[in-house]
């Protein structure tokens, strides 16, 4: 029985050219996290973090993605095309798979504030 819940940074905004932290957190389960996959709205992989073997950063993002903090991901040099959904998929044992969603809006405005809060989707 899957008892866990994924908390995410929810809907966030950041300014063009800046950076943003994509963060998910799995709670309410004792399941062991074996791997976390980070994917973009079009199903393209940004990165995978294996609990023991570390990070795999996909080539299309290698110059713009920094691993961490923790199981999260930092997306840098934001463009308007980065606007959209991002998904964290937690592979766990014995529970199975948990998935969280974050919506990122990249704003042109130089005064855009980066708002981030943890919420349960």
């Amino acid at each position: 029985m899957m008892t866990g819940t994924i908390e995410t940074t929810g809907n966030i905004s950041a300014k063009k050219g800046g950076s943003v932290i994509l963060q998910c957190h799995l709670s309410s389960t004792m399941a062991q996290v074996t791997q976390v996959n980070w994917e973009q709205h079009d199903h393209s992989l940004l990165a995978i973090r294996n609990a023991e073997l570390g990070w795999h950063i996909y080539p299309a993002f290698k110059d713009r993605v920094a691993p961490g903090p923790g199981l999260g991901l930092t997306l840098q040099s934001l463009t308007m095309n980065d606007t959209g959904e991002y998904f964290c998929t937690y592979h766990t044992y014995p529970d199975g798979t948990y998935r969280g969603r974050i919506f990122l809006e990249v704003l042109e405005s130089s005064v855009a504030e980066h708002s981030a809060r943890f919420q349960i989707p």
Epitope: T34, Q35, N37, E39, H43, S44, L45, I48, N50, A51, E52, L53, G54, W55, H56, I57, Y58, P59, A60, K62, P67, H91
Partner: antibody, heavy 119, light 107 residues
């Protein structure tokens, strides 16, 4: 130049154990993961597992848990794989392979170690 | 475990021909696929990573494509030295698994 030099061929009896080494040179050992791959005669490749030399963390293919143990010696930049309770099914060529930087593919391979289990 | 199926165990081709080797994953693996070449008596060599990226020093006659469950490895103009077995591998989830291999034979 990156090199992965594996220990020589082994002929062992059923039920015994064996430890295969993979001595590396030409790069910073702790910055890359190390993996072990099995190739039975005339067959495909099987990922046994990998180890992060930086912290000793290991990830195993469930099929090889209890069969293989992966370790490293940072001081000599050497990776080891111990295989125990050997049977004829374990007869194969075993490769060590380096995980590419921030990637999971294997960019450098050892020359292979042939293990023969026979009474 | 994710099963990687290379439907052709053998493929026969001539020097200068274009040849494509296919690999099918039992579930969606996005672009987490690698292609290796293993020549007779040698260790495998990395050719393509992340489905379509050519590894350093690999000739541009070798290309990879695909995403999801269907992947293709192509040699645009086969050379005699391309005689080898070609393996696909997924690293979308552990255990990382290989296809059964496709042996390329030169006529």
């Amino acid at each position: 130049e990156v090199q992965l030099q594996q220990s020589g061929p082994e002929l062992v009896k059923p039920g015994a154990s064996v430890k295969i080494s993979c001595k590396t040179s030409g790069y910073t050992f702790t910055e890359y993961t190390m993996h072990w791959v099995k190739q039975s005669h005339g067959k495909s490749l099987e990922w046994i597992g990998g180890i992060n030399p930086n912290n000793g963390g290991t990830s195993y293919n469930q099929k090889f848990k209890g069969k293989a143990t992966l370790t490293v010696d940072k001081s000599s930049s050497t990776a080891y794989m111990e295989l125990r309770s050997l049977t004829s099914e374990d007869s194969a060529v075993y490769y060590c392979a380096r995980g590419a930087y921030y990637r999971y593919d294997f960019d450098y391979w050892g020359q292979g170690t042939t293990l023969t289990v026979s009474s | 475990d994710i099963v990687m199926t290379q439907s052709h165990k053998f493929m026969s081709t001539s020097v200068g021909d274009r040849v494509s080797i296919t690999c099918k994953a039992s579930q969606d693996v996005r672009t987490a696929v690698v292609w290796y070449q293993q020549k007779p008596g040698q260790s495998p060599k990395l050719l393509i990573y992340s489905a379509s990226y050519r590894y350093t020093g690999v000739p541009d006659r070798f290309t990879g494509s695909g995403s999801g469950t269907d992947f293709t490895f192509t040699i645009s103009s086969v050379q005699a030295e391309d005689l080898a077995v070609y393996y696909c591998q997924q690293h979308y989830s552990t255990p990382w698994t290989f296809g059964g291999g496709t042996k390329l034979e030169i006529k």
